[in-house]
């Protein structure tokens, strides 16, 4: 990488190296030959997360409840607020700027992976021998009832949306 004129945590201004402001502080005035860089702490609801020469701190992210957001981790002078979604919702992006309702798996499909605050429900088709007869964000595919173990016989075959129907065995007269 190219040579730099200053030490780490310094910047070049007016042919002189000045100290950067530490995280959580903003630049008020550059250093001179006789004075150090002047920095001020960020205000309430503001932050700067790197060594910097910014004259303004960044505003903390607002977790808008109208968008289904809530605070997961409160911001500090050195870190931004982290938002997540209300129960039953998940973020639409990595930045979590808005939320959408968790997807439900339709009949014939079961939940492979339950949704989190940052990922949607993952559905999978119910394979042969399994069914789901509800639209749900939690229900997995259920196995068909085993008629034999109940000493019954299959009267109606199961599908991916319905269970088998068991009935009594025909008696010989």
């Amino acid at each position: 990488e190219p040579p730099t004129a200053c030490r780490e945590k310094q910047y070049l201004i007016n042919s002189q190296c000045c100290s950067l402001c530490q995280p959580g502080q903003k630049l008020v005035s550059d250093c001179t030959e006789f004075t150090e860089t002047e920095c001020l702490p960020c205000g309430e609801s503001e932050f700067l997360d790197t060594w910097n020469r910014e004259t303004h701190c960044h505003q903390h992210k607002y977790c808008d409840p109208n968008l289904g957001l809530r605070v997961q981790q409160k911001g500090t002078s050195e870190t931004d607020t982290i938002c997540t979604c209300e129960e039953g919702w998940h973020c639409t992006s990595e930045a979590c700027e808005s939320c959408v309702l968790h997807r439900s798996c339709s009949p014939g499909f079961g939940v492979k992976q339950i949704a989190t605050g940052v990922s949607d429900t993952i559905c999978e088709p119910c394979p042969v021998g399994f069914f789901s007869n509800v639209s749900s964000a939690f229900e997995k595919c259920h196995p068909w009832t085993s008629c034999e173990t109940k000493d019954l016989v299959v009267q109606q075959a199961g599908t991916n949306k319905t269970d088998v129907v068991c009935g009594p065995q025909d008696r010989l007269r």
């Epitope: 040579p3 730099t4 004129a5 200053c6 030490r7 780490e8 310094q10 070049l12 042919s15 002189q16 190296c17 000045c18 100290s19 250093c31 001179t32 030959e33 004075t35 150090e36 860089t37």
Partner: antibody
Framework: QVQLVQSGAEVKKPGASVKVSCKAS????????MHWVREAPGQGLEWMGW????????NYAQKFQGRVTMTRDTSISTAYMELNRLRSDDTAVYYC???????????????????WGQGTLVTVSS | DIQMTQSPSSVSASVGDRVTITCRAS??????LAWYQKKPGKAPNLLIY???TLQSGVPSRFSGSGSGTDFTLTISSLQPEDFATYYC?????????FGGGTKVEIK
């Protein structure tokens, strides 16, 4: 007491590489930048670059960019300077030199060298 | 890069003489300047930093002055052990640069 002890003299052929070590003792190795300075026969002092032993960050003089690599091993408080593609005009005494403490400097780079290694003579000859 | 020009390149003097060496920077470097003494086969020895601050353990006959572009190293009364080469070095920005050196020889 502070000491910087360098590796011994080296004789190299043109095109080869050399790696010089500088073992620090008597102070907190990660608290001070380490610089490398060379003195060629009949020439003055020439700054080559620095390494921050704490972060591993480096800064090389433009002249040596692409040919020099400065590294460190904090577990043994040792800095290294490797120079590649050696030429006859790289024949010189190479010194490591300790800078002022990290955080000491607020304006300027304030790189003054209060402790030096004993020097390592590198001779490049075919 | 900042060029550092030292003068004279050599000076012949006797024990007890007052010796003055000057160093000029190609651009303003505030007070970010150091002076070193260098003897053959030895590592340099820091004498003065921030233009005028005497390094611990250095005799008070050495003094430095100047700021901006013009700097001076003065040896008020030359001693036998002072015969050496003296270098200035700017510490304002990287790359660090040294003057060409001034050799102080016995007259």
């Amino acid at each position: 007491q502070v000491q910087l002890v360098q590796s011994g003299a080296e004789v190299k052929k043109p095109g080869a590489s050399v790696k010089v070590s500088c073992k620090a003792s008597g102070y907190t190795f990660t608290g001070y930048y380490m610089h490398w300075v060379r003195e060629a026969p009949g020439q003055g002092l020439e700054w080559m670059g620095w390494i921050n032993p704490d972060s591993g960050g480096t800064n090389y003089a433009q002249k040596f960019q692409g040919r020099v690599t400065m590294t460190r091993d904090t577990s043994i408080s040792t800095a290294y300077m490797e120079l590649n593609r050696l030429r006859s005009d790289d024949t010189a005494v190479y010194y490591c030199a300790r800078d002022q403490p990290l955080g000491y400097c607020t304006n300027g780079v304030c790189s003054y060298f209060d402790y030096w290694g004993q020097g390592t003579l590198v001779t490049v000859s075919s | 890069d900042i060029q550092m020009t030292q003068s004279p390149s050599s000076v012949s003097a006797s024990v007890g003489d007052r010796v003055t060496i000057t160093c000029r920077a190609s651009q303003g470097i505030y007070s970010w300047l150091a002076w070193y003494q260098k003897k053959p086969g030895k590592a340099p020895n820091l004498l003065i930093y921030t233009a005028s601050t005497l390094q611990s353990g250095v005799p008070s006959r050495f003094s430095g002055s100047g700021s901006g572009t013009d700097f001076t190293l003065t040896i008020s009364s030359l001693q036998p052990e002072d015969f050496a080469t003296y270098y200035c070095q700017q510490a304002n920005i990287f790359p660090l640069t040294f003057g060409g050196g001034t050799k102080v020889e016995i007259k």
